[in-house]
């Protein structure tokens, strides 16, 4: 029962968190105008992954596609490739976690496989997380240093007489929906992982042997490690769902940035 | 068609409070945001703030240090402007205008005139 | 806040010929995001409010005559009416559209010689 219920735990919380990954890769929020400098701006700048933004104060929002490939600087490819791996992997991961979900029965369907199918999903989650924490974590790196670039030339005088303010960029909502959802897909692929070693068949056919030794009885049952490290009431384990749990409520709690005009 | 009528001509005496009514028709009152303009005799232009009808967000000018206040009605798609502590430099005429593409002024109330004198 | 000055303060021009209008601004009107100058004009008649020309620097306010274009970039735009009629008698003002506070130049005033 344990079993069914970690890896269904493992299956929602990484269904919930390749939403997120999709979400984050199609929203247009990934940098934002900095507004330290100036909180409410007549002209207020966005970028996502595909197009960038302008909303203007008359409530005019403005957004063009990045038409071209080859003129796109390579660490957002880089990002770009990564989310999009993150994603294939993860439905492909959510499509074979399906099959392999205890509670579902198709035909006669062996535990073994189901076991072998669950591991899979479970690292094709990991692997997914681990893609959009690594791009997320690509383009904040990305924002950081040009951040840090244009706040060196801020002010560019020209001709000595006039300024004109180069506008920076932040954190935009995106990253901590990507961060979020990355973390969410790394945790439900690990509770998969979990779950796929209480699926793997129990050896019964082979009965207990005891073996006596001088003033000592010491019993040896086969799958007696799956026994030890079982989910039923070994406090460890549940001391790893409870954190698991509670992971997902500090990481759904996590406060995303907003900026209004 | 787009239309933005003003209240009438006002007369206050310095120390006192103004407001000045905007009403909107012709148009979907919650999707453009409205900036008052003044205009003291024989000058320039000054913007004062605008509000947004839909979230009622506003932003004034800070030269007004808190005199001014914006408000809405939705349900007669009103915006009043409302400035105290007047003071005779505050003699003018008050414009509600729309805004546009651009942060542009597309439309323009008939303008209020507003006299402050003891 | 940004600074709009405006030249000449007022102009005089024979009816069909060209008048110019300068506008310059302490900073950039540029947005990187799109491209787009935030620079609007706008014609006022006496006892009337102003009437929008051109917004974006150089986008024509549909309805209003192609005698009127507007130009520039970043610090400097220019206003220019290509064949001056009658009706084009006004004060003529620039305005930052980029920058809160949002900020008129002085205004040119446009006459027939």
């Known amino acids: 029962m344990a079993v069914t219920a970690c890896q269904g735990l493992g299956f929602v919380v990484s269904l919930i968190g390749i939403a997120g990954i999709i979400a984050a890769t199609c929203m247009d929020q990934w940098s934002t105008q900095d507004l330290y400098n100036n909180p409410v701006t007549a002209v207020f700048n966005y970028q996502g992954l595909w197009r960038s933004c302008v909303r203007e104060s008359s409530g005019f929002t403005e957004c063009r596609g990045y038409f071209t490939l080859l003129g796109l600087p390579a660490m957002l490819q880089a990002v770009r490739a990564l989310m999009i791996v993150g994603i294939v992997l993860g439905a492909i991961g959510l499509l074979v976690s399906i099959f392999a979900l205890k509670c579902i029965r198709i035909g006669s369907m062996e535990d073994s496989a189901k076991a072998n199918m669950t591991l899979t999903s479970g690292i094709m989650f990991i692997v997914s997380g681990l893609c959009a924490i690594a791009g997320v974590s690509v383009f904040a790196n990305m924002l950081v240093t040009n951040f840090w670039m244009s706040t060196a030339n801020m002010y560019t005088g020209m001709g000595g007489m006039v300024q004109t303010v180069q506008t920076r960029y932040t954190f935009g909502a995106a990253l901590f929906v990507g961060w979020v959802a990355g973390g969410l897909t790394l945790i439900g692929g690990v509770m998969m992982c979990i779950a796929c070693r209480g699926l793997a068949p129990e050896e019964t056919n082979y009965k207990a042997v005891s073996y006596h030794a001088s003033g000592h009885s010491v019993a040896y049952k086969p799958g007696g490690f799956k026994a030890s490290t079982g989910f039923g009431s070994n406090t460890k384990n549940k001391k790893i769902y409870d954190g698991g749990a509670r992971t997902e409520d500090e990481v759904q709690s996590y406060p995303s940035k907003h900026d209004y005009v | 068609q787009v239309q933005l009528v003003q209240s009438g001509a006002e007369v206050k005496k310095p120390g006192a409070s103004v407001k000045v009514s905007c009403k909107a028709s012709g148009y979907s009152f919650t999707g453009y945001n409205m900036n008052w303009v003044r205009q003291a005799p024989g000058q320039g232009l000054e913007w004062m703030g605008n509000i947004d009808p839909y979230y009622g967000g506003t932003s004034y000018n800070q030269k007004f240090k808190g005199r001014v206040t914006l408000t809405i009605d939705k349900s007669t798609s009103t915006v009043y402007m409302e400035l105290s502590s007047l003071r005779s430099e505050d003699t003018a005429v008050y414009y509600c205008?729309?805004?546009?593409?651009?942060?542009?002024?597309?439309?323009w109330g008939q303008g209020t005139t507003v006299t402050v004198s003891s | 806040d940004i600074v709009m000055t405006q030249s000449p303060d007022s102009l005089a021009v024979s009816l069909g010929e060209r008048a110019t209008i300068n506008c310059k601004s302490s900073q950039s009107l540029l947005n990187s995001g799109n491209l787009k100058n935030y620079l609007t004009w706008y014609q006022q008649k006496p006892g009337q409010p102003p009437k929008l020309l051109i917004y974006w620097a150089s986008t024509r306010k549909s309805g209003v005559p192609d005698r009127f274009s507007g130009s520039g970039s970043g610090t400097d735009f220019t206003l220019t009416i290509s064949s001056l009629q009658a009706e084009d008698v006004a004060v003529y003002y620039c305005?930052?559209?980029?920058?809160?506070?949002?900020?008129f130049g002085g205004g040119t005033k446009v006459e027939i010689k």
């Open positions: 205008a729309r805004m546009y593409h651009g942060n542009a002024f597309d439309y």
């Open positions: 305005q930052n559209d980029y920058s809160y506070p949002l900020t």
